[in-house]
Amino acid sequence: RGVFRREAHKSEIAHRYNDLGEQHFKGLVLIAFSQYLQKCSYDEHAKLVQEVTDFAKTCVADESAANCDKSLHTLFGDKLCAIPNLRENYGELADCCTKQEPERNECFLQHKDDNPSLPPFERPEAEAMCTSFKENPTTFMGHYLHEVARRHPYFYAPELLYYAEQYNEILTQCCAEADKESCLTPKLDGVKEKALVSSVRQRMKCSSMQKFGERAFKAWAVARLSQTFPNADFAEITKLATDLTKVNKECCHGDLLECADDRAELAKYMCENQATISSKLQTCCDKPLLKKAHCLSEVEHDTMPADLPAIAADFVEDQEVCKNYAEAKDVFLGTFLYEYSRRHPDYSVSLLLRLAKKYEATLEKCCAEANPPACYGTVLAEFQPLVEEPKNLVKTNCDLYEKLGEYGFQNAILVRYTQKAPQVSTPTLVEAARNLGRVGTKCCTLPEDQRLPCVEDYLSAILNRVCLLHEKTPVSEHVTKCCSGSLVERRPCFSALTVDETYVPKEFKAETFTFHSDICTLPEKEKQIKKQTALAELVKHKPKATAEQLKTVMDDFAQFLDTCCKAADKDTCFSTEGPNLVTRCKDALA
């Protein structure tokens, strides 16, 4: 049973325009176009959005008007396919326009580029930003939606509207301040960080839908919702999971208007049924739509019921275990996942799904034997190693993070992952290590019972991006092996990888380690990336270098940069000291 209205509408576009309102309608259409055609300029897309909106208004006025009965995919696809020079700019994506719906839309979806060759989204100076924001807030926000959506083609559209709203509020507040810069920078950095995490998390959900289908996603949703709403019964959790699956499936399928509409409907349902869901929803439910839906998506866990019986009662000790399993496998496994998850808000969803998988495999094996209870009687004890592995991972990595700080921790991960997959391009390794390294800042400062879910589920999302980038140009058998398995096994697979013994080390090229004075004026982040690029290249040259050797080289390198950047004649310092540094590096690693 789902909450969504199913009545047919004569005009789908009129129906969505009425439900969403003009502002959200236009924002979502802009996101959709920007995610499909990632190279087009804002002005090109804005023109199409205006045309679609004008058309929607004619359909609102008269649902029987010409073409108002067409599907949204047909209407949007026709707009996109009418863009001039489509083949010159997009190559084979233009072939999608030769197909009929619904193939055309799915063709567009398959051509979304997770790593488009677009320059990084640079934030203008505070004064310039405030000027253009004051001149035309709508255009300013349109640019924001366009720039984020084209770089993140699977960004969760209704959530992107929320971030745009946050952006708007920050600018409204800070542009009225005397010191705009110091007001804007930390606030916008916070929004950017949250949005980037939101992007990789949503991409993981779409990967799950694409590769494994809604069955896998629904299992994820049941576990996650059971942790958050431990007082809701199984029927309620199943209903919410079904609806959440539909919403995500729509967004991943490019049906952004339906997705946003259904998400609003789900938020409304949750707020109308707080009594059967959770005692923690009221604060969220008092907020306006975008904030409400966002708030509900990350609401704190409800207090666990005090009188929950031991999990063993129904799933190990009950004499009917095999009978119940055989009668309705999915429902029985679903109730196991629900019961286990609501008792363990301290576990990651990935871990809970691995435990459910282990339980299923045990029943498959044991229920075919002569004495099933004797066979599955120890199943809960067999969970122990599966639970210990991620717990140890969290402890080891958080200890390392506390010792080294974020930058040092990123470097440790970079060395580790370059050794695991040295064939992967250096930019990809650096990006992955920087993202994986942020897990420390994000999760290691949390209370003990929140660390594991934070660490493992975040790492899984980042590793999903590694897999997507590697899929484009597969170069490492190690990475292919870990990315080919199920989503929940990826993180343990990557963690278990060791030095790739098949790799032939890169020859030492002096130019890779030659630097110029322009590095001195780079922002701190860019400087770090340059140093991390050199570190990855060192490991590719000497995959078996010890941590001590690498530390010696990197300390020397940092000292060299510090000295030359402080020198009166920077260029001379770089050109004379640089070669000496290269020689010392070679010697240190010999």
Epitope: G2, R6, P102, E103, E106, L109, Q110, C206, M209, Q210, K211, F212, G213, E214, R215, A216, F217, K218, K249, C252, H253, K329, D330
Partner: nanobody
Framework: QVQLVEFGGGLVQAGDSLRLSCAAS????????MAWFRQVPGKEREFVAA????????RYIDSVKGRFTLSRDNTKNMVYLQMNSLKPDDTAVYYC??????????????????WGQGTQVTVSS
């Protein structure tokens, strides 16, 4: 394993109607959607129509919209493709397919795990 059997194909005149049926049997596995594809010798298999098992949502390729209607009978694990106003272009082997995971795409053959043997539909002018 799931077994799929298609029947109802045959030779008809342009403008006539045919009703294809597909019966799914085998282990009790959730069916998320069932689809019909068609193939002409020397060409790729082409998506025709699909129906979701729970909501009954349907998708049709543009060229058959208004002429073909897809329906299902969940109790019998059957899906039917009613084909009206047939054209010579509709001549092909029609295959029934099942998606047991609920994958994202409707029109990709890789979204479907189980396939029938196919039934020939010939429309003469």
């Amino acid at each position: 394993q799931v077994q799929l059997v298609e029947f109802g194909g045959g030779l008809v005149q342009a403008g006539d109607s045919l009703r294809l049926s597909c019966a799914a049997s085998g282990r009790s596995l959730g069916i998320y959607k069932m689809a019909w594809f068609r193939q002409v010798p020397g060409k790729e298999r082409e998506f025709v129509a699909a129906i979701s098992w729970s909501g009954g949502t349907t998708r049709y390729i543009d060229s058959v919209k208004g002429r073909f209607t897809l329906s299902r009978d969940n109790t019998k694990n059957m899906v039917y493709l009613q084909m009206n106003s047939l054209k010579p272009d509709d001549t092909a082997v029609y295959y029934c397919a099942v998606d047991s995971s609920g994958r994202l795409y409707w029109t990709l053959s890789t979204s479907y795990d189980y396939w029938g043997q196919g039934t020939q539909v010939t429309v003469s002018s």
